[in-house]
């Protein structure tokens, strides 16, 4: 019996087609992805093949103005239209709190939403009961397939799930659910979830009874053969893991942003054992037409977005200096504003020992593309912010050793004075440079804001200590020459859309007046 698994993950609000790098579509003839194009391909496969499942491995939420405005209603609407069979909860599904998940998505989705390792407690337990499930058994042709969901146990540090959801260890939580499915005579089981490729592989290895793992979170691109676009494969598709009980378990992921549709064919024997598996992600390029009815619906929903981008978010009573003459040479107040917003967006009161789990931000000055003039009545709009942060990136959470941070700050000024983009703006960091010293030895003081303290204060950076830092995904991926970050990071979790982070902060503060306050000094 053959099953076709179509899968997406980390779509992050890319409802419309995008450029090849998943930013805003500029030249339509070369654009990719989007739900209208995805629907065309899915329907083509559904018509051609008998046993098809369309699955999403989480993080539909967060990433473009679509999510800012529609807050998840767009996800439910268009996933319903595409007739997804199941979705696993990702960490970003909690970005607007539990209410922001329940009302727009859980109550509106016509497909099951899954996570076996999220347990509700207290007053939330009855409110959320039945709205998401640990597993779902689906009829597929003449057979049944069990799907068990899982979500990153780091979600409390990455999003806003509140205090009434407990995120358990994935493997510990999945095993009893899979065991139950087995006792209920379900012999074909897919683990669908959002914990990253390393955890996906562990699930394949450790959870007895799981036949296939469909993952997300790490934006992993797998491919067999010559890849069709710019993404470099992290391994073959499917990636085969040998389980502890000797089975070959295929593990798949489909990069991110709706650029690809994962396509996996699995052959099962009568007992539900995987006999063979093969496939590849399908690049959703312009050779695949956009479905006209879905496209028309997208255009209808788009109208509200255009209105939103000109509405006032808040006011500034000072000039927001985002000029390259400032932000690529010295501390600029636009950099301070953005870093303060990044830290504010990551406030999660972890426990009594820590005032927060992260206190530091770094931001490449070259990523700040425009100032905002306060003389326009002080008004700040989404449109203004889109000029400052036009690349559609995310502000991510990484863990780095102190020694890596020191290298990053040396890189920040290694060719100072040439108006290059790598000059770092900061938050929760005091840095002093001596430009008279040779490149690679210019950082003379580097103090960082403590997290394990009740009264935050600045202490010298310790080379061997592990620090959490908020930074643009561009830097986490080694952009602007920050190869040491990419090579040495100990953990990387993708965060929220950059503009959304800053707009939310401005809306919250109502009136802003960021200053230049001595975060970056030259001796």
């Amino acid at each position: 019996w053959e099953l076709t698994i179509l899968h997406t993950n980390d779509v992050h609000s890319r409802l419309e087609q995008t450029s090849e790098d998943s930013s805003k579509c500029v030249n339509a003839s070369r654009c990719m992805g989007g739900v209208a194009r995805l629907f065309t391909k899915v329907q083509q496969i559904r018509r051609a093949e008998p046993n098809v499942l369309l699955l999403d491995a989480g993080d539909q939420y967060q990433g473009t103005i679509w999510f800012t405005v529609y807050k998840g209603a767009e996800v439910a609407h268009f996933m319903n239209a595409l007739r997804y069979d199941a979705m696993a909860l990702g960490n970003h599904e909690f970005d607007n709190g539990v209410e922001g998940l329940i009302e727009p998505l859980l109550k509106e989705a016509k497909f099951p939403i899954l996570s076996a390792n999220i347990k509700a407690k207290g007053p939330l337990a009855s409110q959320i009961s039945g709205l998401y499930l640990p597993y779902k058994v689906l009829p597929v042709g003449d057979e049944v397939v069990g799907i068990v969901g899982y979500t990153s146990k780091e979600t409390p540090f990455l999003s806003n799930p509140g205090t009434n959801l407990v995120f358990e260890d994935e493997i510990t939580a999945l095993q009893p659910e899979v065991d139950k499915l087995k006792t209920l005579n379900v012999n074909k089981i897919i683990a669908l979830g959002h914990s990253g490729f390393e955890t996906d592989k562990l699930i394949a290895q450790k959870v007895r009874g799981v036949d296939v793992v469909v993952g997300g979170h790490s934006n992993t691109f797998l491919y067999t053969g010559n890849p069709p676009s710019k993404e470099v494969p992290a391994g073959k598709y499917p990636f085969i893991v040998t389980s502890d009980d000797g089975r070959k378990v295929p593990v798949v992921q489909a990069y991110a942003f709706g650029k690809y549709l994962g396509y996996l064919k699995i052959e099962f024997d009568e007992r539900g054992n995987v006999i063979s598996s093969h496939g590849n992600p399908i690049l959703l390029n312009s050779s695949i037409p956009e479905d006209p009815s879905i496209k028309a619906d997208i255009n209808k929903w788009r109208i509200k977005l255009d209105n939103y981008s000109t509405q006032e978010l808040g006011k500034t009573i000072v000039y927001l200096d985002g000029s390259s003459q400032s932000c690529r040479f010295r501390e600029c107040n636009m950099g301070n504003l953005i870093c303060d917003a990044m830290i504010n967006n990551n406030l999660r009161h972890a426990d009594e020992m820590f005032w927060n789990h992260v206190s530091m931000c770094i931001l490449n000055g070259g990523g700040i593309r425009s100032p905002i003039d306060e003389r326009n009545n002080g008004t700040i709009t989404w449109e203004n912010l889109a000029a400052v942060l036009p690349f559609g990136g995310t502000f991510d959470l990484v863990q780095l050793k102190g020694s890596t941070l020191k290298k990053a700050f040396e890189h920040s000024v290694h060719r100072y004075g040439q108006s290059t983009g790598e000059f770092l703006q900061v938050g929760g960091i005091h840095v002093v440079y001596d430009l008279s010293r040779k490149p690679g030895d210019r950082v003379v003081k580097l103090d960082v804001l403590c997290t394990k303290c009740r009264v935050p204060s600045y202490d010298p950076l310790k080379m061997d200590e592990i620090y959490k830092v908020i930074l643009p995904n561009f830097l986490a991926n080694g952009g602007d020459g920050f190869q040491m970050i990419k090579d040495e990071l100990l953990r990387h979790d993708s965060g929220d859309q950059d503009i959304n982070v800053v707009s939310t902060y401005i809306s919250k503060m109502k009136v802003i007046y960021p200053a230049v306050e001595g975060r970056i000094k030259f001796s």
Partner: antibody
Framework: QVQLVESGGGVAQPGRSLSLSCAAS????????MHWVRQAPGKGLEWVAL????????YYADSVKGRFSISRDNSKNTLYLQMNSLRAEDTAVYYC????????????WGQGTLVTVSS | EIVLTQSPATLSLSPGERATLSCRAS??????LAWYQQKPGQAPRLLIY???NRATGIPARFSGSGSGTDFTLTISSLEPEDFAVYYC?????????FGPGTKVDIK
């Protein structure tokens, strides 16, 4: 031990409605699909409808499609069959049946309730 | 829809004899075929599922075989309590059909 007890049978006129219930006990009701199967007097068995363990899918025999509706309340461990637009050929004993293996193993049957459609 | 034909309609045998009941499908039903026993005034009882698996508590004298379109229920040595009507049942695309039944009576 597993028990399935049907109720609600009786006499109804053609064109009228009747509702059957089945009270389940002795097993985790919400884990199992449930069927209604009927048997006209002196005749063979005829499958009527199936409902998924969580009520997310329903399937019907062509002979009852559009007239009968299967439902369940997992909090009450109860299966229902709403029968509308009844016809004389719907006269039968209606059995409530547990499905232990996704349509392959109808392993526990109730004793049945008789529905008579007559003017 | 798939039609099941059972033969013979009636099988007259003595206790201790072997009974072979046949069920033929109008098209392939893979292995999704079950056998039920029904005695007068009682509900049916599951005997065999997935063509050849004995249900819980069913004596070893009952066995099922076959695949595709041709299936057989065999009772190796009839006991007095085995005289009843036997139905086969299939599912295909979540639509279920029963055969018309074979009555096994005492010769």
């Amino acid at each position: 031990q597993v028990q399935l007890v049907e109720s609600g049978g009786g006499v109804a006129q053609p064109g009228r409605s009747l509702s059957l219930s089945c009270a389940a006990s002795g097993f985790t009701f919400s884990d199992y699909g449930m069927h209604w199967v009927r048997q006209a007097p002196g005749k063979g068995l005829e499958w009527v409808a199936l409902i998924w363990y969580d009520a997310s899918f329903e399937y019907y025999a062509d002979s009852v499609k559009g007239r009968f509706s299967i439902s369940r309340d997992n909090s009450k461990n109860t299966l229902y069959l709403q029968m509308n637009s009844l016809r004389a050929e719907d006269t039968a004993v209606y059995y409530c049946v547990r499905d232990a293996q996704w349509g392959s193993r109808l392993d526990y049957w109730g004793q049945g309730t008789l529905v008579t459609v007559s003017s | 829809e798939i039609v099941l034909t059972q033969s013979p309609a009636t099988l007259s045998l003595s206790p201790g004899e072997r009974a072979t009941l046949s069920c033929r499908a109008s098209q392939s039903v893979s292995r999704y075929l079950a056998w039920y026993q029904q005695k007068p005034g009682q509900a049916p009882r599951l005997l065999i599922y997935d063509a050849s698996n004995r249900a819980t508590g069913i004596p070893a004298r009952f066995s099922g075989s076959g695949s595709g379109t041709d299936f057989t229920l065999t009772i190796s040595s009839l006991e007095p309590e085995d005289f009843a009507v036997y139905y086969c049942q299939q599912r295909s695309n979540w639509i279920f059909t029963f055969g018309p039944g074979t009555k096994v009576d005492i010769k």
